[in-house]
């Protein structure tokens, strides 16, 4: 077995980090392929091991547990396939960021003929994500997802108000979020479950 | 505006004890691997501690292992470094730093407090 | 410890480009991405130039730049000032845990 190139890895800046590793040839992962991985700087850091699973027939991933990592961590990886080591690297989870999805997406009717989408971010007070992250909120018709719009939340509350005129009336609607870190380097979250609503407003007398 | 501010250097005989301290501020210090540097009169610098964010990790430089602990507070957002057996070449000068990044990346220092020691 | 080797000296003209050196082993510069670059003006805290051989730190200008080859790391001031003479140091990881640090080079501008 060989290892093709470097693995790809993030981390959810929270709990895990996840690698995968492309391989030359088919592979069980978990009854082949060992990673050890363990924080470095510190001599009497905790040596831990991640039992990868196959993402593909030639694919591993390995999902590793980094509880409350923060920016000045690095982990020395080592990944085994029985007394041979395959792959030596480092990986720091400030590095490559991948927040977790943003949940419970809901839609609130608003007094003055708008929308308020609301959703939840998932890091408590004390990750740096807490007030880091931006939003992404795509908003397609159900029926075509090719006629979108999209909206840029840059500011840290997560909601985002929008006229209900700016969408037709008489059309179902489909809005998802992802969030991304502005201050560490990484790549947008998975998109949010989306939620489908109606979009129903009477138009004024001119327009009918 | 991140400040690091040490005390509680001074004049010590050989053999004897001290504990200098480092008060943080302007920043999320529970976030944040810290160190001490030292650097001896008309000397270079010096590597002597680290200490993991959450502060159960700790690492030493060989010439103070035994002798130095390292320790924080994040309740007080406080650095400390508790050196006893003080030798003669532990006289120098000793900063406070803060990590960021790896851990050779030291991107805010204190002022320093002096600690001689001599008989 | 044994340090990473630094030249105790180098000068360069105004304007001019100068490199200072940091030699070490497999274990330490040749085996990391850690290495950073501190100056140190006198009766002053060092303050940080460059972390992980290469990333400008925050307000540093271009001017400065680091690099590594094998077992050496290498800081390069182009453009160089008066205001640059000072005391350049660099830090290394070394596979033991520790850190070390060259034993500092004084920049003079000629």
């Known amino acids: 077995i060989k290892v093709l190139g470097e693995p790809t890895c993030f981390s959810d800046y929270i709990r895990t980090s996840t690698c995968e590793w492309f391989l030359d040839s088919a592979v069980d992962c978990s009854s082949q392929l060992c990673l050890h991985y363990r924080l470095m700087f510190f001599e009497f850091s905790e040596n831990l091991t991640c039992i990868p699973r196959n993402s593909a027939s030639t694919v591993c991933v390995c999902h590793m547990e980094m509880n409350r990592p923060v920016q000045s961590d690095r982990y020395q990886m080592e990944l085994w396939a029985e007394h041979r080591q395959l792959w030596q690297g480092s990986f720091s989870p400030s590095g490559n960021v991948k927040p977790l999805a943003p949940d419970n997406l809901t839609l609130h009717t608003n007094v003055s003929d708008e929308w308020l989408l609301t959703w939840n971010n998932l890091y408590p007070s004390n990750n740096l994500l807490y007030k880091d992250l931006i939003s992404m909120v795509n908003i397609s018709r159900e029926d075509n997802p090719a006629e979108f719009i999209v909206y840029n939340v840059t500011y840290k509350e997560p909601r985002l108000s929008f006229p209900i005129n700016i969408l037709m009336s008489g059309v179902y609607y489909t809005a998802r979020v992802r969030v991304r870190s502005q201050i560490l380097t990484g790549t947008w979250s998975e998109w949010s479950p989306s939620i489908t609503w109606y979009n129903h407003f009477q138009l004024p007398l001119i327009q009918r | 505006e991140v400040q690091l501010v040490e005390s509680g250097g001074g004049l010590v005989q050989p053999g004897g004890s001290l504990r200098v301290s480092c008060a943080a501020s302007g920043f999320t210090f529970s976030s944040y691997y810290m160190a001490w540097v030292r650097q001896a009169p008309g000397k270079g610098l010096e590597w002597v501690s680290h200490?993991?964010?959450?502060?159960?990790?700790?690492q030493y430089a060989d010439s103070v292992k035994g002798r130095f602990t390292i320790s924080r507070d994040n309740a007080k957002s406080t650095l400390y470094l508790q050196m006893n057996s003080l030798k003669p070449e532990d006289t120098a000068l000793y900063y406070c730093?803060?990590?960021?990044?790896?851990?050779?990346?030291?991107?805010?220092w204190g002022q320093g407090t002096q600690v001689s020691v001599s008989s | 410890h044994s340090a990473v080797t630094q030249p105790p000296s180098v000068s360069g003209s105004p304007g001019k480009t100068v490199t200072i050196s940091c030699a070490g082993t497999?274990?330490?510069?040749?085996?990391?991405?850690?290495v950073s670059w501190y100056q140190q003006f006198p009766g002053t805290a060092p303050k940080l130039l460059i972390y992980e051989v290469n990333k400008r730190a925050s307000g540093i200008p271009d001017r400065f730049s680091g690099s590594k080859s094998g077992n050496t790391a290498s800081l390069s001031i182009s453009g160089l000032q008066s205001e640059d003479e000072a005391d350049y140091y660099c830090a290394s990881y070394r596979s033991n845990n520790n850190i070390v640090f060259g034993g500092g080079t004084h920049l003079t501008v000629l």
């Open positions: 730093v803060r990590i960021y990044g790896d851990a050779t990346s030291y991107d805010y």
């Open positions: 497999s274990s330490d510069i040749g085996g990391y991405n850690y």
């Open positions: 200490i993991h964010a959450g502060g159960s990790l700790t």
